[in-house]
Interface confidence: low
């Protein structure tokens, strides 16, 4: 069952799925000047059995110079339905853990892929949030959102995260006052 909506937006934060439930689809998008090969699948699909999950199909992009060098491939209407976007990142790894059963890892990049990946998430998917650089994460609870089915409709739970700038006071009891970083910005636990 596909999730109807996008995960919640948090000001000054981005989200990322780090493992993808079976049934998740990833559009085969190409960067400007390239298009999906004619015989290529429009999406990759996370499938699996009881012991192993992997992405079916492979995305392939070819130069569209022969046709229209500025045209960027856009999904067909059925591909656009319930499209989900996440920031393109390097492959995620769950620290020192085995793969999650029933989940696929982030697919490796393919040649000439678009800068943004468009996912179609399924019920049960979890996405994780982090503050953008220069903002500090304050937590009331999990910085994550889960797509759930309730009364026949899908919804994303609300991540309990606030990303605050250096001038904003802490709102959370039990939290230590932030120490200024050398460049004067508040340090964020997700900044590197």
């Amino acid at each position: 069952e596909l999730c109807d909506d996008d995960p919640p937006k948090i000001t000054h934060a981005t989200f990322k799925a780090v493992a993808y439930k079976e049934g998740t689809m990833l559009n085969c998008e190409c960067k400007r000047g390239f298009r999906r090969i004619k015989s290529g699948s429009p999406y990759m699909l996370c499938t699996g059995n009881s012991s192993h999950s992997s992405w079916d199909n492979q995305c392939q992009c070819t130069s569209s110079a022969a046709r229209n060098t500025t045209k960027q491939v856009t999904p067909q209407p059925e591909e656009q339905k319930e499209r989900k976007t996440t920031e393109m990142q390097s492959q995620m790894q769950l620290a020192d853990q085995v793969s999650l059963p029933g989940h696929c890892r982030e697919p490796p990049p393919w040649e000439n892929e678009a800068t943004e990946r468009i996912y179609h998430f399924v019920v049960g998917q979890t996405v994780y949030y982090q503050c953008v650089q220069g903002y500090r994460a304050l937590h009331r609870g999990p910085a994550e959102s889960v797509c759930k089915m309730t009364h026949g409709k899908t919804r994303w739970t609300q991540p309990q995260l606030i990303c605050t700038g250096e001038t904003e006071p802490s709102q959370f009891p039990g939290e230590e006052e932030p120490q200024a970083s050398p460049d004067g910005l508040p340090e964020s636990e997700t900044s590197r």
Epitope: K16, V18, A95, Y129, V146, F172, E189, T190
Partner: antibody, heavy 130, light 107 residues
């Protein structure tokens, strides 16, 4: 193998200080938030503090805020708990425990211990008594 | 803070029997609940995370269920090594809190 080895407990008088250490090995220390959890004699578990993987964010239980300081030295794979102004009610076995985050080569996503506290230290006893 | 109440305080059972432990939260914690096992003189051990997911290396006889405010840890058939104290813990709100524990003892 994956382990957290604790040290630094002992008997101390009320009002005095003590520092606990928790040395990590067998895993990538910087991919984990680390907690301190304590257990008074014959009682249940009480969460004390947590520090984010790079040491920037620290949270405390109200019962220890202002008296205890959690810190970590990622170059030494070691976690610390500096306990000042100790009270009789701080008497307990103190455990350090790790919680994994999802990490890339560039950063960790603050999933807030999605997998629970999956590896614990052996515990160290702190007795506050006059 | 969220209060977790475990019941019963003590459960007296024989090896091979089924154990059902309850954890009730003072307000909804969604599915953000973990279960730990602790034996005398040892550190706690993670059994279940997020209400129903078995941690790495945990035998299939341990299962968790529930969401919102009511949760259950079930041990389908008690082994001698399962007699211990069990704690639930929520991560839905700061601060993280534990239940007071349920002791599973040999009858």
């Amino acid at each position: 193998q994956v382990q957290l080895v604790q040290s630094g407990g002992g008997v101390v008088q009320p009002g005095r200080s003590l520092r606990l250490s928790c040395a990590a090995s067998g895993f990538t220390f910087t991919n984990y938030a680390i907690h301190w959890v304590r257990q008074a004699p014959g009682k249940g578990l009480e969460w004390v503090a947590v520090i984010w993987s790079d040491g920037d964010n620290k949270y405390y239980a109200d019962s220890v805020k202002g008296r205890f300081t959690i810190s970590r030295d990622n170059s030494k794979n070691t976690l610390y708990l500096q306990m000042n102004s100790l009270r009789a009610e701080d008497t307990a076995v103190y455990y350090c425990a790790r919680t994994p985050w999802y990490c890339t080569s560039t950063n960790c996503y603050t999933g807030y211990y999605y997998y629970g506290m999956d590896v614990w230290g052996q515990g160290t006893t702190v007795t506050v008594s006059s | 803070e969220i209060v977790l109440t475990q019941s019963p305080a003590t459960l007296s059972l024989s090896p091979g029997e089924r154990a059902t432990l309850s954890c009730r939260a003072s307000q909804s914690v969604s599915s953000y609940l973990a279960w730990y096992q602790q034996k005398p003189g040892q550190a706690p051990r993670l059994l279940i995370y997020d209400a129903s997911n078995r941690a790495t290396g945990i035998p299939a006889r341990f299962s968790g269920s529930g969401s919102g405010t009511d949760f259950t840890l079930t041990i389908s058939s008690l082994e001698p090594e399962d007699f211990a104290v069990y704690y639930c813990q929520q991560r839905s709100n700061w601060p993280p809190t534990f239940g007071q524990g349920t002791k599973v003892e040999i009858k």
